[in-house]
């Protein structure tokens, strides 16, 4: 089942070529696998990657560029994703999600 993640919807505006950081606040007891999705207007949401907090590893969805995203846990209750070298095509709503069992 889906778990709630304590998220505050934020708007971030950045210049082309810069980086952006997105924070995901994890609910108590969240699983060690956290997924990142991108939803762009007129498209279905697509999973970009997931983070395995047990091994500190990232698994990229097929077709996702390595080096574009960096995600890591800064605390037990907080996960951050950095988007590098931004271009207009990166615009959209980014979600984090996790599942129990």
């Amino acid at each position: 089942k889906s778990s709630n993640l304590e998220g505050r919807t934020k708007s971030v505006i950045r210049q082309t070529g810069s980086s952006a950081e997105i924070t995901c606040d994890l609910a108590e007891g969240s699983t060690g696998y956290i997924h990142w999705y991108l939803h762009q207007e007129g498209k279905a949401p697509q999973r970009l990657l997931y983070y395995d907090s047990y091994t500190s590893s990232v698994v990229l969805e097929s077709g996702i560029s390595p080096g574009k995203y960096d995600t890591y846990g800064s605390t037990r209750k907080n996960l951050r994703m950095i988007l590098r070298n931004l271009i207009e095509n990166d615009s959209g709503v980014y979600y984090c999600a996790t599942w129990d069992g």
Epitope: T55, S56, S57, V58, L60, S62, G63, I64, S65, P66, G67, K68, Y72, R84, N85, I87, N89
Partner: antibody, heavy 122, light 108 residues
């Protein structure tokens, strides 16, 4: 001179694991990402994953998720790529390649190891 | 995201110039100036020939040059020589496939 020297060729049976090493010299090991790329016979280059300079995090291609593990030993300036549950389609030359930028990867690979041929056959 | 597309083969005579294309999208080749090119001789490891679209590493002949227009990057080899016969791969930041499909260059 910057150099990456890989371990010798290996022959493995289906279902087994293989661990390939890549020893770096001539530069500050903990300043660069390392990538692993494979090439099946007669085929193109296929990116597998990367490990960050400190060895604290890794990124894997989905295709290899759950089967590949990248590690590094900073004391010996050596990277390792372990691939488990081998099948015949894993027969390939495996390369390590240094990301030539510092910390923020900016996508160019230089130098490359000489390659390690892994043959999976029953 | 689709792969970076290269012609399967190109050929030229000694002394001629040839161009190898690498076509991507606005999310990879068109979006960044981070295209690199690699030469691979049979049985050998790839070698970096061009980085950041048009920069040549030291030790690489100035017969090799790179450029980009829109979503397509190009590698041009002038004054073709027998030792240029090899496979060539492009790579672009932003590409899910990381590497292009590869081009076999034959020197006639």
């Amino acid at each position: 001179e910057v150099q990456l020297v890989q371990s010798e060729a290996e022959v493995k049976k289906p279902g087994a694991s293989v661990k390939v090493s890549c020893k770096a010299s001539g530069y500050t090991f903990t300043r660069h990402y390392m990538h692993w790329v494979r090439q099946a016979p007669g085929q193109g280059l296929e990116w597998m994953g990367l490990i960050n300079p400190s060895g604290s995090s890794t990124v894997y291609a989905q295709k290899f998720q759950g089967r590949v593990t990248l590690t590094r030993d900073t004391s010996t300036s050596t990277d390792y790529m372990e691939l488990s549950s081998l099948r015949s389609e894993d027969t390939a030359v495996y390369y390590c390649a240094r990301d030539n930028s510092h910390l923020d990867q900016v996508w160019w690979f230089d130098p490359w190891g000489q390659g390690t041929l892994v043959t999976v056959s029953s | 995201q689709s792969a970076l597309t290269q012609p399967a083969s190109v050929s030229g005579s000694p002394g001629q110039s040839i161009t190898i294309s690498c076509t991507g999208t606005s999310s990879d080749v068109g979006g960044y100036n981070y295209v690199s090119w690699y030469q691979q001789h049979p049985g050998k490891a790839p070698k970096l020939m061009i980085y950041d679209v048009s920069n040549r590493p030291s030790g690489v002949s100035n017969r090799f040059s790179g450029s980009k227009s829109g979503n397509t990057a190009s590698l041009t080899i002038s004054g073709l020589q027998a030792e240029d016969e090899a496979d060539y791969y492009c790579s672009s930041y932003g590409s899910g496939s990381v590497f292009g499909t590869g081009t076999k260059l034959t020197v006639l």
